[in-house]
Interface confidence: low
């Protein structure tokens, strides 16, 4: 999906009002310094591409993020403020429902959510020079 035509300010508002709090809740019990941020993005469409990938694509050691509260709110924000996004996700969501069995949060998931927090922070500061 091409995130170029999304309403970035509305997505930013959704992040600041709820998604950010849910990410913090998920990470409760971990220090911000516990994980090094290795994933980055260069502009807002790129950030949303990476956020979408890390949130909804199962990775080795962490297959359980898609049903978390922050993930569901991310999905809703993208569906509302990115034209045509929800249509592209129907098949992916059905496949995910078949695959998912039980919720088990691992250290790998915590690391992944820590990366997501970094991507979202970057998304909110698009004019900031890349480190």
């Amino acid at each position: 999906y091409d995130f170029t035509n999304c309403d970035f300010e509305k997505i930013k508002a959704a992040y600041l009002s709820t998604i950010s709090k849910d990410l913090i809740t998920y990470m409760s019990g971990t220090k911000s310094t516990e994980f090094n941020n290795t994933v980055s993005c260069s502009n807002r469409p790129h950030c949303l591409t990476e956020i979408q990938s890390l949130t909804f694509n199962p990775t080795a050691g962490c297959a359980s993020l898609a049903k978390e509260m922050f993930a569901m709110k991310t999905k809703a924000a993208l569906a509302i403020w990115c034209p045509g996004y929800s249509e592209t996700q129907i098949n992916a969501t059905q496949a995910m429902k078949k695959r998912r069995k039980r919720k088990v949060t691992t250290n790998k998931c915590l690391e992944q959510v820590s990366q997501l927090q970094g991507l979202w922070r970057r998304f909110n500061r698009p004019l900031l020079k890349q480190q």
Epitope: Y26, K31, E34, V104, K108
Partner: antibody
């Protein structure tokens, strides 16, 4: 096989100290929060202390706060409970358990066989 | 602190018959993340406790499907659809919403 094995229990006088150890095997110890639970003779279960996977956060029951210290060594796959200023009411079987943090719903999915601590003069 | 209250204290059940244990918390166990932090354990005679149900209704690995958990907020129930001889022991509920974590007083299940 996932296993937790406690050691270090025994008889100690009131005011004395004891150090319990728990050896973990069969799973990636550093991924999991750990918890000590105790059970006084003929009584129910009582949560004692929990430590998060990277020791970032530590919690204690009010009944042991200031007297007990939980710690872990992820390199050695071991959990410890240092018990000082022991009282008669600390007499119990102490269980080392896996879990107790937000990440696994807090449920304790693996339990050791338990170790008896008797505080008596 | 959250207080957990279990009823009944003891239960005598005929093999093959259903059994039900209630657990009540002094405040809601629903977290803002949508999960309810209530778990059930069984301690068989002479053994360490074992996890049966986590987060209200999820059966732990290896737990027979005759065990089921339900409830919300402050009222929870553990049901055994058909009690077997191996189900005897003391059942405990536990909340891990906030520290200090706390267990119910236990319900002893015996076979008639």
């Amino acid at each position: 096989e996932v296993q937790l094995v406690e050691s270090g229990g025994g008889l100690v006088q009131p005011g004395g100290s004891l150090r319990l150890s728990c050896a973990a095997s069969g799973f990636t110890f550093s991924n999991y929060d750990m918890t000590w639970v105790r059970q006084a003779p003929g009584k129910g279960l009582e949560w004692v202390s929990s430590i998060t996977f990277a020791s970032s956060y530590i919690y204690y029951a009010d009944s042991v706060k200031g007297r007990f210290t939980i710690s872990r060594d992820n390199a050695k796959n071991s959990l410890s409970l240092q018990m000082n200023s022991l009282r008669a009411e600390d007499t119990a079987v102490y269980y080392c358990t896996r879990g107790g943090g937000a990440y696994h719903g807090g449920s304790l999915d693996v339990w050791g066989q338990g170790v008896l601590v008797t505080v008596s003069s | 602190d959250i207080v957990m209250t279990q009823t009944p204290l003891s239960l005598s059940v005929t093999p093959g018959e259903p059994a039900s244990i209630s657990c009540r918390s002094s405040q809601s166990l629903l977290h803002i993340n949508g999960y309810t932090y209530l778990h059930w354990y069984l301690q068989k005679p002479g053994q360490s406790p074992q996890l049966l149900i986590y987060l209200v209704s999820h059966r732990a690995s290896g737990v027979p499907d005759r065990f089921s958990g339900s409830g919300s907020d402050t009222d929870f129930t553990l049901k055994i659809s058909r009690v077997e001889a191996e189900d005897v022991g003391v059942y405990y509920c536990e909340q891990t919403l906030q520290t200090p974590y706390s267990f119910g007083g236990g319900t002893k299940v015996e076979i008639k």
